[in-house]
């Protein structure tokens, strides 16, 4: 009598997650009487996948009708494959008994599952950084198989090179994760810039997945401050302007101080955006020179995005000699970021 053979023709089968996998197995003889069982893995820890004899295996069906005696095909189909189904499957013939006696195993078929990576998620720094600083962005994607994957970073279409990428785990696994960090040097022009993390994988058929982050979430562009005085009006009032320019984000509070005392506080809102994404804001303060005997120190104090306040100060000189005054006297810069403005007390 010819020796029983259990034939698993495919050494490996690769299936896309969600599809069905067919694992082929034929036997050369139905003698002796006894069941065929399918296992994943070998040895004492093997997992029973299908038992023609009994049990409930909702995702597994016999390819051929096992109730036909002349049927020597014991192939199975596993539906709705997930990465967790990956492994080596063995078709095993038993002789009927108590317990059933294992007679012969097939050589095994390795099932690998092609699983798409999840959509890349890009996260930026927890706190904003100013221009000329370098910030880190991370990109993560999970659940893909096989392990081979390509990840690229772009800033405004240009590939970034300061990148560190890891695929985990290092050894064999049912699915893998990728984590990449890109270091990006910020410039004042980056409010409208975008970084893109692009993931390419065999399951994506050449159509990579992309995750994006806007640098607007990571950057802070501190304002420039300029204080100017308009011409003295006939009513002895001086119009002082504080120009706050090229800042981002919009969150900004401006406080006018007269001789150290708060005169007025304003919050920026609904400002028009510059082409580069930054904002400008101008605030005016009208100072009645005739109401002051002594010099007036005016300070424009700007608190931007929760950062320490930036000051620009003026000294308005109250003069008893109107002839000495200029109607629009040039500013005199001092070490304390002050400007001296001479006004007549008239």
């Amino acid at each position: 009598e010819e020796e029983l053979q259990v034939i698993q023709p495919e050494k490996s089968v690769s299936v896309a997650a969600g599809d069905s996998a067919t694992l082929n197995c034929t036997v050369s003889s139905l003698i002796p009487v006894g069941p065929i069982q399918w296992f994943r893995g070998a040895g004492p820890g093997r997992e029973l996948i299908y038992n023609l004899k009994e049990g409930h295996f909702p995702r597994v069906t016999a390819v051929s009708d096992p109730t036909k005696r002349n049927n020597m095909d014991f192939s199975i189909r596993i539906s709705n494959i997930t990465p967790a189904d990956a492994g080596t499957y063995y078709c095993v013939k038993f002789r009927k008994g108590s317990p059933d006696v294992e007679l012969k195993s097939g050589a095994g078929t390795e099932l690998s599952v092609r699983a798409k990576p999840s959509a890349p998620v890009v996260s930026g720094p927890a706190v904003r950084a100013t221009a000329e600083h370098t910030v880190s962005f991370t990109c993560e994607s999970h659940g893909f198989s096989p392990r081979d994957i390509t990840l690229k970073w772009f800033k405004n279409g240009n590939e970034l090179s300061d990148v560190q990428t890891n695929v985990d785990p290092a050894g064999k696994s049912v699915s893998y994760s990728i984590r990449s960090t890109a270091r990006v040097l910020l410039t004042r022009r980056d409010v409208h810039s975008q970084v893109i993390c692009e993931v390419a994988h065999v399951t994506l058929q050449g159509d990579p997945l992309r995750g994006t982050a806007n640098l607007s979430e990571a950057i802070r562009v501190p304002p420039f401050l300029e204080v100017t005085q308009q011409s003295m009006r006939a009513d002895n009032q001086v119009n002082v302007t504080c120009q706050v320019t090229k800042f981002y984000p919009q969150r900004l509070q401006l406080t006018w101080l007269e001789n150290g005392n708060v005169s007025r506080t304003e919050m920026a809102s609904a400002l028009p955006e510059n082409k580069d994404g930054t904002y400008n804001w101008t605030s005016w303060l009208l100072v009645n020179v005739s109401a002051h005997r002594d010099d007036v120190k005016l300070t424009c104090q700007v608190e931007h995005d929760g950062q320490p306040a930036v000051n620009k100060s003026f000294s308005v000189k109250v003069s008893a000699h109107p002839k000495e005054q200029g109607s629009n006297t040039a500013a005199e810069n001092t070490g304390t970021n002050e400007r001296n403005i001479y006004g007549g007390s008239g």
């Epitope: 009598e1 139905l30 009487v33 009927k96 008994g97 108590s98």
Partner: antibody
Framework: EVQLVESGGGLVQPGGSLRLSCAAS????????MHWVRQAPGKGLEWVSA???????YYTGSVKGRFTISRENAKNSLYLQMNSLRASDTAVYYC????????????WGQGTMVTVSS | DIQMTQSPSSLSASVGDRVTITCRAS??????LAWFQQKPGKAPKSLIY???SLHSGVPSKFSGSGSGTDFTLTISSLQPEDFATYYC?????????FGQGTKLEIK
């Protein structure tokens, strides 16, 4: 339709012989283990004999050496040659098909009556 | 030989009842146990194999369980056509052996 039809039963004297036949239709008999089961009047079921797909044969102790099971593939038929019959062999004899991979009985014939009496 | 013992030998029940018949093997038979139904003057009908698998066409009111030496056949809601004699059988090794039968009668 899968069917088993027995024939050959009848009245026979103790020590006599009888050959039972079982004609199979709807399937290939040689692909299955086949069995004979009997039931004495008013009694329970008793397995008598079997023939495997490889031609291997099995018998219950009380019929060993007296009964012979065989099959004829060309006629898709199963036989039970009964010699040296005894009164205790009186029963309805059923031809039964063994299930696919574990030999669980699935198809039964209608039975044929064998009476051994003088 | 493996001895098969059924209990009870007879059982009276009413239509709609749930009944359980037990079968014990004299040694471990794995789950190679079958159940058959037989009505007077008729050939047995195969109900269950490998202790719990229903043969094609057998209604789901029949269920089997057990492994090793102790087995049960349960009929969930008796109908008039279910009153018959039921046999268990081991088929793990030759000679195959049957239980003595359980006669299910209408109360």
């Amino acid at each position: 339709e899968v069917q088993l039809v027995e024939s050959g039963g009848g009245l026979v004297q103790p020590g006599g012989s009888l050959r039972l036949s079982c004609a199979a239709s709807g399937f290939t008999l040689s692909s299955y283990d086949m069995h004979w089961v009997r039931q004495a009047p008013g009694k329970g079921l008793e397995w008598v004999s079997a023939i495997g797909t490889a031609g291997d044969t099995y018998y219950t102790g009380s019929v060993k050496g007296r009964f012979t099971i065989s099959r004829e593939n060309a006629k898709n038929s199963l036989y039970l040659q009964m010699n040296s019959l005894r009164a205790s062999d009186t029963a309805v004899y059923y031809c039964v098909r063994g299930g696919v991979w574990d030999d669980a009985f699935d198809i039964w014939g209608q039975g044929t009556m064998v009476t051994v009496s003088s | 030989d493996i001895q098969m013992t059924q209990s009870p030998s007879s059982l009276s029940a009413s239509v709609g009842d749930r009944v359980t018949i037990t079968c014990r093997a004299s040694q471990d038979i794995n789950n190679y146990l079958a159940w058959f139904q037989q009505k007077p003057g008729k050939a047995p009908k195969s109900l269950i194999y490998t202790a719990s698998s229903l043969h094609s066409g057998v209604p789901s009111k029949f269920s089997g369980s057990g492994s090793g030496t102790d087995f049960t056949l349960t009929i969930s809601s008796l109908q008039p056509e279910d009153f018959a004699t039921y046999y268990c059988q081991q088929y793990v090794s030759y000679p195959y052996t049957f239980g003595q039968g359980t006669k299910l009668e209408i109360k």
